[in-house]
Interface confidence: medium
């Protein structure tokens, strides 16, 4: 922001009324009036270029310093070319000297040169040559100097002529302030510019109404430079929740709009399934039947729990069931749908039912499922199972009602035994098997059927209550087809896969485990 100038002295604006002191009195500097652009202007002028040594002083009136620390002196003046006078005026000069003196009181007409300190020699950039003078072209020079720090109540300026033809048209003395400023929604007060060029005065800003320093943010600060310019902004304020930035102020969100936190963003329109908000809203309430999960941003539409899974099938495969379903037709407006599967088993004879989570095995954890299928195994044969698939989303916990679909299935067979070859010789094969423990209690005996590969006319059967058997009197180096089947009170269970096991050849005899 541009520096603000506070004028302490303005000769041009005073219309010749200031009555500055000239020394020696009645010689040298003289107050003159001229016409420029059809307007009368006043100037202090001296032109003793032919008279040898000159020491003519012009002193301003006493200027009250006030709060100024560094003053700026702007001079507008014209200087005639020494060559424009006959014979070049050998004693003619083209510069003059600028002085100042500080004091706590006005000395009036008591002028003492020794009290003055030289600021600088003032030289023109352009001198007025004869042709310009004759044509009334005033070659106006502008020079600026600064002095500081000032400490006394006031000061004088003085101009020393040493034999130039010069006219002072304007003497303006001012100090600089960093102007009152609104930046980053912070207000910075008008601040006097410091006196030392390298130093920057740190000024704390205050947030405008309804603005705050964001959490973890820096307090607003600016630096007031010596030239009255604000520099190096640090930190900022943001419009608080319910308010948005409009130019340099925070304005309440309009009805139907909201802003949920202090940020640079504008107010947003209330999302779908919300009630119209009042002015200055930080959020928009949900319509009846719609909810907002704790982690949902305020900008998200309100949502509701999903409907039940659309279509559920249970396909039995021995002692396993594959459950498949399709997503709910109404997601409730959310994408965070998960499924939970629960299981209930019923005994056909007694009609008694109970949960079966402990006795069955799921292909993946049955709660928080994101896929739409799961396999349930370790089911007991000759048992009725009811499976419930519930659809839930982020707001399901906010209501008591549930959205689920059920499917029932009856298990008539045990699961096929898993068969392993434990050992073999030239004439025997040792075979073992297993079935899920929950089904074991329902198995009466196991039936092992075996035959030579390629011989479809004859086969052998062995029954046992255990989980293994050794098949003897076999031919060496021969492949046998082996299958194990559980027998229950209700009949046969599911048979295992048909396995191919080979006896050893006579050369490689010995009972080797495989």
């Amino acid at each position: 922001a541009q520096g603000k100038e506070v004028v302490l002295l303005d000769f041009a604006a005073a219309g010749g009324e200031l009555g500055w002191l000239t020394h020696p009195y009645g010689k040298g500097w003289d107050l003159m009036q001229n016409i420029m652009n059809d307007m009368p202007i006043y100037m202090y002028s001296v032109c003793n270029v032919m008279s040898g040594d000159q020491d003519n002083w012009l002193r301003t009136n006493w200027v009250y310093r006030g709060e100024a620390e560094r003053i700026f002196i702007e001079l507008k003046f014209t200087v005639r070319d020494c060559n424009s006078f006959p014979g070049g005026a050998s004693s003619c000069k083209e510069t003059f000297n600028l002085y100042y003196a500080e004091s706590d009181l006005d000395y009036g007409t008591n002028f003492q040169k020794r009290l003055f300190t030289k600021i600088d020699t003032i030289a023109p950039d352009e001198i007025t040559v004869s042709s310009d003078f004759e044509a009334r072209h005033v070659k106006l020079n502008v020079e600026e100097r600064s002095v500081g720090p000032l400490t006394r109540k006031g000061f004088y300026l003085a101009f020393q002529d040493i034999g130039a033809c010069v006219a002072l048209l304007s003497v303006r003395v001012y100090y600089k302030k960093c102007p009152e400023l609104l930046q980053g929604l912070a207000h910075f007060p008008e601040t006097i510019a410091g006196s030392d060029a390298p130093s920057l005065a740190t000024v704390a800003g205050t947030c405008v109404d309804h603005a705050v320093v964001p959490p973890g943010g820096e307090e607003p600060r600016m630096h007031c430079a010596v030239d009255g310019e604000w520099l190096v902004p640090i930190g900022q304020c943001l419009c608080q929740a319910g308010y948005e930035k409009v130019e340099d102020a925070c304005q309440a969100c309009s009805p139907g709009f909201f802003k949920f936190e202090a940020s640079e963003s504008p107010c947003l329109e209330c999302p779908e399934h919300t009630l119209p908000s009042p002015e200055g809203a930080t959020s928009c309430e949900c319509e009846e039947g719609f909810f907002r999960a704790p982690q949902d941003p305020a900008s998200m539409p309100c949502t509701r729990p999903p409907s039940a899974p659309h279509y559920l099938t249970a396909v039995g495969m021995g002692a396993k069931v594959e459950l498949r379903w399709t997503p709910p037709q109404d997601s409730g407006g959310r994408e965070d749908i998960v499924y939970s599967v629960t299981c209930e088993q019923c005994w056909p004879e007694s009609g008694e039912c109970g949960p079966c989570e402990a006795s069955v095995r799921y292909s993946e954890p049955p709660h928080g499922l994101t896929r739409t299928s799961v396999t349930v195994s370790d089911l007991e044969p000759h048992m009725n199972y009811t499976f419930t698939v519930e659809a839930r989303n982020g707001v399901s916990g906010l209501v008591t009602s549930r959205s689920f679909r059920t499917a029932s299935v009856s298990i008539n067979q045990t699961e096929p035994p898993k068969v392993r070859l434990e050992g073999r010789s030239t004439t025997s094969l040792s075979v073992s098997w297993s079935i899920p423990p929950p089904q074991q209690s329902r198995v009466w005996k196991y039936e092992v059927t075996y035959r030579k590969k390629g011989d479809s006319n004859s086969y052998n059967v062995r029954r046992t209550e255990g989980f293994s058997v050794t098949l003897d009197d076999l031919a060496p180096d021969t492949t046998y087809l082996v299958q194990v089947q559980a027998l229950t009170q209700e009949g046969q269970g599911a048979g295992s896969k048909v396995h191919e096991f080979q006896t050893l050849s006579p050369e490689g005899s010995g009972n080797l485990a495989v």
Epitope: M32, Q33, N34, I35, P40, M43, S45, V46, C47, N48, V49, M50, T78, V79, R80, S84, F85, P86, T128, S130, S131, F133, E134, A135, R136, V138, C165, V166, A167, L169
Partner: antibody, heavy 128, light 107 residues
Amino acid sequence: EVQLLESGGGLVQPGGSLRLSCAASGFTFSHYMMAWVRQAPGKGLEWVSRIGPSGGPTHYADSVKGRFTISRDNSKNTLYLQMNSLRAEDTAVYYCAGYDSGYDYVAVAGPAEYFQHWGQGTLVTVSS
Amino acid sequence: DIQMTQSPSSLSASVGDRVTITCRASQSISTWLAWYQQKPGKAPKLLIYKASNLHTGVPSRFSGSGSGTEFSLTISGLQPDDFATYYCQQYNQYSRTFGQGTKVEIK
């Protein structure tokens, strides 16, 4: 020594024309503002017209505006005044006058000029 | 235009007298005023410019003063060569105007 010598005056009938000349010597003519000043018999001085050192700008008294034309030829060191539509009240001695700012010890020139050097004058009589 | 009024229109004085002629402007002209001397049948001669500055070669018995609207020409110790008509002229405006003249005669 500065010398200005007017010529071209004489008797002329009302409505007639006359051209006055002023020959300059003894100074750098092209540095000077030049002017014509007249004096009716037994009366005071009246400024008529001026011209800048290089031929412009030119100014005229209201009483002659549109009838008189001032000009100069710096190569010939000569000033002219072309007078048309002459009237009886134009009867006067016409002086050519010059001003050189080098002799004017002021920092800023006055809005107009005064006259440092004068010719001896030439009489113009307008009569029927 | 600015009107210039001189007074008196004529005066009689003796050699050695101190003579003052005044010139009044109809509006302020700062110090943009010149004084001329004219003898019968001759061209005017510049005496003073910028109200108080003596033109080159003019005797120091001539002096000028004043600013704004009131000006004066003083001859301190009148000499025989000084009997003439004196004119003031303003050059604050391009329509430079002269006073009507003051004739200084021998008493």
